[in-house]
């Protein structure tokens, strides 16, 4: 049977070194806040990742900017609040030498 | 000033469990093959990642599917040759129990 | 405890501009919302807008965009509206509220008249 | 937007009298995933400000008599009275905070 085989240029495309999608928890992006809640506890960024055809390579930001969100901080006894949180996203990626 | 700000129910939905595209090495899914090298060392598969809203649940795949992919296997002292490998990606994701 | 002193009432005449003060006491006026609430004579409530104090970030109701601005002094904890061009579809008595998605506390509201 | 529609606009009952109002939006208010609805009651006496008496559509504010009962998911919601005493004289608002904030009309209650 003809299964659909996904062709080296594509694979290599989609695996190359760029900005993809992370859930990322909160918590390890606001350290200070352990004590507290968030709903939601992870919020989805933009990071570099893949690979570099080259293993003397890595994949590293270029660019940043920075995303702010609105969540849920579930405080002791209280209800919840809405506060506005901001996150760096990685916008640009390139692969650089691992010793830079 | 009005910054954009991504609303929290916008933040909830791309924060919540779901198959997300993943950059995986090849070697993690065919330990077998460590002693060789693939070219890309990485391939893009759909994984269930993301937050569930309740610490009692985690999310998990509840239907998955195989994609077979074209690679480059080098092999020492040989010229690479095109391989196929078969990986399973997640489809549908759920959250569910931690403990089922 | 929590309260949020708002300004005093306020007779104005058409096409002039007022600014309504509400200061913020009891609580660290940087973690949460402030709410802006208009209640018109013979109407129900509206949402106006909000400002995030602890960034100074902004989001109106559509139907108040260039009628209504909000500012804050983090300094001494005040929220502030101004509203410009008045019409007599401005009289009305505003309330400041905090929090958000639930609003918990509000002001005592100002009454805002526009006569000529 | 999201438009919520109270009924009756205003009511009279006895003291002592269950009443019930009702709010329906004009899209769902629930987050699946939090299995939460962003809605609230507010309950408004002549010549006072607004007071929160029930969010997530079910959940009593702290000091709030257990005579007010939220309940309702998704699009059609309820708050009830069981036994309405002469202080809860005032304007019921229903509030969405699913996508920024509106209030419903309001229902007026008074005494007999």
């Known amino acids: 049977s003809e299964v659909e085989v996904v062709p080296f240029q594509e694979v290599w495309g989609r695996s190359y070194c760029r900005a993809l999608e992370r859930l990322v928890d909160v918590v390890s992006e606001y350290p200070s806040e352990v004590e507290h809640m968030f709903s939601p506890s992870c919020v989805s960024l933009l990071r570099c990742t893949g690979c570099c055809g080259d293993e003397n390579l890595h994949c590293v930001p270029v660019e940043t900017a920075n995303v702010t969100m609105q969540l849920l901080k579930i405080r002791s006894g209280d209800r919840p609040s809405y506060v506005e949180l901001t996150f760096s996203q990685h916008v640009r990626c390139e692969c650089r030498p691992l010793r830079e | 000033s009005e910054v954009e700000v991504v609303p929290f129910q916008e933040v909830w939905g791309r924060s919540y469990c779901r198959a997300l595209e993943r950059l995986v090495d090849v070697v993690s899914e065919y330990p077998s093959e460590v002693e060789h090298m693939f070219s890309p060392s990485c391939v893009s598969l759909l994984r269930c990642t993301g937050c569930c809203g309740d610490e009692n649940l985690h999310c998990v795949p509840v239907e998955t599917a195989n994609v077979t992919m074209q690679l480059l296997k080098i092999r020492s002292g040989d010229r690479p040759s095109y391989v196929e490998l078969t990986f399973s990606q997640h489809v549908r994701c759920e959250c569910r129990p931690l403990r089922e | 405890q929590v309260q949020l002193q708002q300004s005093g009432a306020e007779l104005v005449k058409p096409g002039a501009s007022v600014k309504i003060s509400c200061k913020a006491s009891?609580?660290?006026?940087?973690?949460?919302?402030i709410n802006w609430v208009k209640l018109a004579p013979g109407q129900g409530l509206e949402w106006i807008g909000w400002i995030y104090p602890g960034s100074g970030n902004t989001k109106y109701n559509e139907k108040f965009k260039g009628k209504a601005t909000l500012t804050i002094d983090t300094s001494s904890s005040t929220a502030y509206m101004q509203l410009s061009s008045l019409t007599s579809e401005d009289t009305a008595v505003y309330f400041c509220v905090r929090d958000s998605p639930f609003f918990d506390y509000w002001g005592q509201g100002t009454l805002l008249t526009v006569s000529s | 937007d999201i438009v919520l529609t109270q009924s009756p606009d205003s009511l009279a009952v006895s003291l002592g009298e269950r009443v019930t109002m009702n709010c329906k939006s004009s899209q769902s208010l629930l987050n699946s995933g939090m299995r939460k609805s962003f809605l609230a009651w507010y309950q408004q006496k002549p010549g006072q400000s607004p007071k929160l008496l029930i969010y997530w559509a079910s959940t009593r504010e702290s000091g709030v008599p257990d005579r007010f009962t939220g309940s309702g998911s998704g699009t059609d919601f309820t708050l009830t009275i069981s036994s309405v005493q002469a202080e809860d004289v005032a304007v019921y608002y229903c509030?969405?905070?699913?996508?920024?904030?509106?209030f419903g009309s309001g229902t007026k209650l008074e005494i007999k």
């Open positions: 509030k969405q905070s699913y996508h920024l904030f509106t």
């Open positions: 009891g609580y660290t006026f940087t973690d949460y919302y």
